[in-house]
Interface confidence: low
Amino acid sequence: TPWSLARPQGSCSLEGVEIKGGSFRLLQEGQALEYVCPSGFYPYPVQTRTCRSTGSWSTLKTQDQKTVRKAECRAVRCPAPVSFENGIYTPRLGSYPVGGNVSFECEDGFILRGSPVRQCRPNGMWDGETAVCDNGGAGYCSNPGIPIGTRKVGSQYRLEDSVTYHCSRGLTLRGSQRRTCQEGGSWSGTEPSCQDSFMYDTPQEVAEAFLSSLTETIEGVDAEDGHGPGEQQKRKIVLDPSGSMNIYLVLDGSDSIGASNFTGAKKCLVNLIEKVASYGVKPRYGLVTYATYPKIWVKVSEADSSNADWVTKQLNEINYEDHKLKSGTNTKKALQAVYSMMSWPDDVPPEGWNRTRHVIILMTDGLHNMGGDPITVIDEIRDLLYIGKDRKNPREDYLDVYVFGVGPLVNQVNINALASKKDNEQHVFKVKDMENLEDVFYQMIDESQSLSLCGMVWEHRKGTDYHKQPWQAKISVIRPSKGHESCMGAVVSEYFVLTAAHCFTVDDKEHSIKVSVGGEKRDLEIEVVLFHPNYNINGKKEAGIPEFYDYDVALIKLKNKLKYGQTIRPICLPCTEGTTRALRLPPTTTCQQQKEELLPAQDIKALFVSEEEKKLTRKEVYIKNGDKKGSCERDAQYAPGYDKVKDISEVVTPRFLCTGGVSPYADPNTCRGDSGGPLIVHKRSRFIQVGVISWGVVDVCKNQKRQKQVPAHARDFHINLFQVLPWLKEKLQDEDLGFL
């Protein structure tokens, strides 16, 4: 919504509209105003006022219709539990201050499910989950609980029994008013909550809830079998290879949105497309903007609608001015445009229609002011897709409607009515402003914390070194009276770090090996170091080769599972399903095809990560895998101890990749402390490890300072991971990496 601080163009005076303890800003070219309070405060009695045709602002009325003379900022408080079954809560207050706690305890014989202690947050919402006291014998379904602030009617939980929820006057119900106990022991719909007008979802909450719901739709994991009565079943869907997914992006372009918010919404959707592509799913996109009339920019039936880059290009080319002349808000017509894309000619359903999942993502600042109630179109869409008709197969998984309400004018009842309601999921979101929504989608694409996606980084100006290289591990081996060896490594799974074998000797004890990740000071406990069985540094001593680095790879197994986060995340390994998805290749991609994609017979742009003066920096190099490969490998003869070697293939085996030199560009070189670190190919915004740094021809890092000028024969050699895959596959078989 565009904020204008000029005098309203309407006829309402600004005299006397001030709010005590806060400020106001004008919306809709002065036809409305929003009161703004500091964090932890909310505008009382209303958040917005409209300029009436009489030339006066709408009156300040409380929820019980009393008129107030002057608006004020009041401290946010969280609602008290209306009732709590089979237990007690303390302290018992009428409402709770921000930061205040409420604790729940159960009567004898009942077990607490949910959060025993909940804290009131600055947005007026409680943290944690609904506390329920259950004795396990309630019925076919478990007790659905009473979310704080709601009232529940119904206490029978047999199959097909229903419970209904109500909110106190002045509060709006979000979620399902009625929930029914279903086959399998789950409750229909989504948990309700009572919302005050000042309550907004925080970007973190929205990102988490939206992502977790969206991934339920697109992750493609089997639902677990054997859910007994009362067990919560998570919605997990098998993406049938013959099935598909359509995502309809519907964007409000009415005049109340404003140009900058429209641009912001476009950014959000671009990030969403990127995010979905990163899962390896290739949905078809429909793209609609609307005001008085809808405009379809991309139809799902178009050949390129599944090309994420092309759809992004179309999205970027949309101009806010496109709806300038007809700038009402007709959400019904917009959804009818979506319906028209879903329906089929001559009403003859095409083959596979019932295996297509449909996701509608609607972004708006206020919803309809013309055209009638859009909920009727949602009902028509549900009819078309045969959703909710057959009790045995309700097909709810085939339609998800997400609604993002942005700004203070959002009608909570309307957006809640349109959004899908699914157990343990949230489909309706209300955010303060477009910047907040951009934050949501930024976090969503760059954090992806809900998934162990490999090779993802958080590229942001405020990110630390380990945000940008979250896989990077630092290794040091303490050897009494011999000083210590420093190496690098890469996190490849929750239990394993991949590094070079030469960093260790057979005498090194686990306790003398220090590994740290994520820039953390603490060292991780080591269970065991696994060497490649063919590694033997002394293997060719008799042949006059003092050190032989063939198969120079090792895996460090950690005692405790790593907790992935922004600064600790795995790198992608070749020939895994994760890499197939990262490169957005078809699911049928073979290991050989990945190799052709990552290591074609040419100069390949790659990078390694080095530590310079306590800072991690990326160094761009070229793997010589084409016509320069031979000369690169021949330069190994300049390495100390290799000058007598007649046939260089004695030391440079097929296991090595070669970088360095001055062509096509002058490559930076690795240093001793870089050994064991990953050699990485950066593709499609993802990072895939293709090698392990092993040895170099010239020590260009004397005295800890990198020399600027290095000879052309300064080459580096790295173990090619494609050449040690059987070993990696064997050792990492329990790590869920999905080796091809």
Partner: antibody, heavy 118, light 111 residues
Framework: EVQLVQSGAEVKKPGASVKVSCKAS????????MDWVRQATGQGLEWIGD????????GYNQKFKGRATMTVNKSISTAYMELSSLRSEDTAVYYC???????????WGQGTLVTVSS | DNVLTQSPDSLAVSLGERATISCRAS??????????MHWYQQKPGQPPKLLIY???NLKSGVPDRFSGSGSGTDFTLTISSLQAEDAATYYC?????????FGQGTKLEIK
């Protein structure tokens, strides 16, 4: 212990230049950005710019661009700020301040008073 | 540039009482989940001293009577129980993007 020690007070004529130094100790000089901030007598704080000592990259407040030059000498862990074409309104205390991981100014020099007077 | 406006310009508070200073930014200082707003204390003849970083984090060594709150564009520095040594000028500063800017300062006196 982190310390930033600045050069002594200077008196300059309008149109001249002044170069203030800031010697850092107690930490790795190249690890953190160094910022320059000034304060006229009885007035507030005004950010001039920052320099990354590792890459010697700079960011300036547009108001000072072209007049202020920030440099470092890594070998002696010292940052410099030179201000040219001085005018009387440049009379102020000039501070160097070291950024922390959160881009806040965690450590400050004691300040250098620069007086511009004819 | 992001203009930071502090209020009030000056205030006098009795010992042991609560003091509150506000800082409003013309543009949001929030990015990547953090609010890049910091608070400093300056006494005459001394350089400023960092009290609060990222809107609400107390710098180690700073007494816990100081606290910061806020998000986006509106921020508050609170001194819960004023001590004699807290008489000083307080500044907010953002580092969301270049150029970094300071508020005009709030002079806090003991009543």
């Amino acid at each position: 212990e982190v310390q930033l020690v600045q050069s002594g007070a200077e008196v300059k004529k309008p149109g001249a230049s002044v170069k203030v130094s800031c010697k850092a100790s107690g930490y790795t000089f190249t690890d953190y950005n160094m910022d320059w901030v000034r304060q006229a007598t009885g007035q507030g704080l005004e950010w001039i710019g920052d320099i990354n000592p590792n890459y010697e990259s700079t960011g300036y407040n547009q108001k000072f661009k072209g007049r202020a030059t920030m440099t470092v000498n890594k070998s002696i862990s010292t940052a410099y700020m030179e201000l040219s074409s001085l005018r009387s309104e440049d009379t102020a205390v000039y501070y160097c301040a070291r950024e922390d991981d959160h881009d806040a100014f965690a450590y400050w020099g004691q300040g250098t008073l620069v007086t511009v007077s004819s | 540039d992001n203009v930071l406006t502090q209020s009030p310009d000056s205030l006098a508070v009795s010992l042991g009482e609560r003091a509150t200073i506000s800082c409003r930014a013309s543009k949001s200082v929030r990015t990547s989940g953090y609010n890049y707003m910091h608070w400093y204390q300056q006494k005459p003849g001394q350089p400023p001293k960092l009290l609060i970083y990222l809107a609400s984090n107390l710098k180690s060594g700073v007494p816990d009577r100081f606290s910061g709150s806020g998000s986006g564009t509106d921020f508050t520095l609170t001194i819960s129980s004023l001590q004699a040594e807290d008489a000083a000028t307080y500044y907010c500063q953002h580092s969301r993007e270049l150029p970094y800017t300071f508020g005009q300062g709030t002079k806090l006196e003991i009543k």
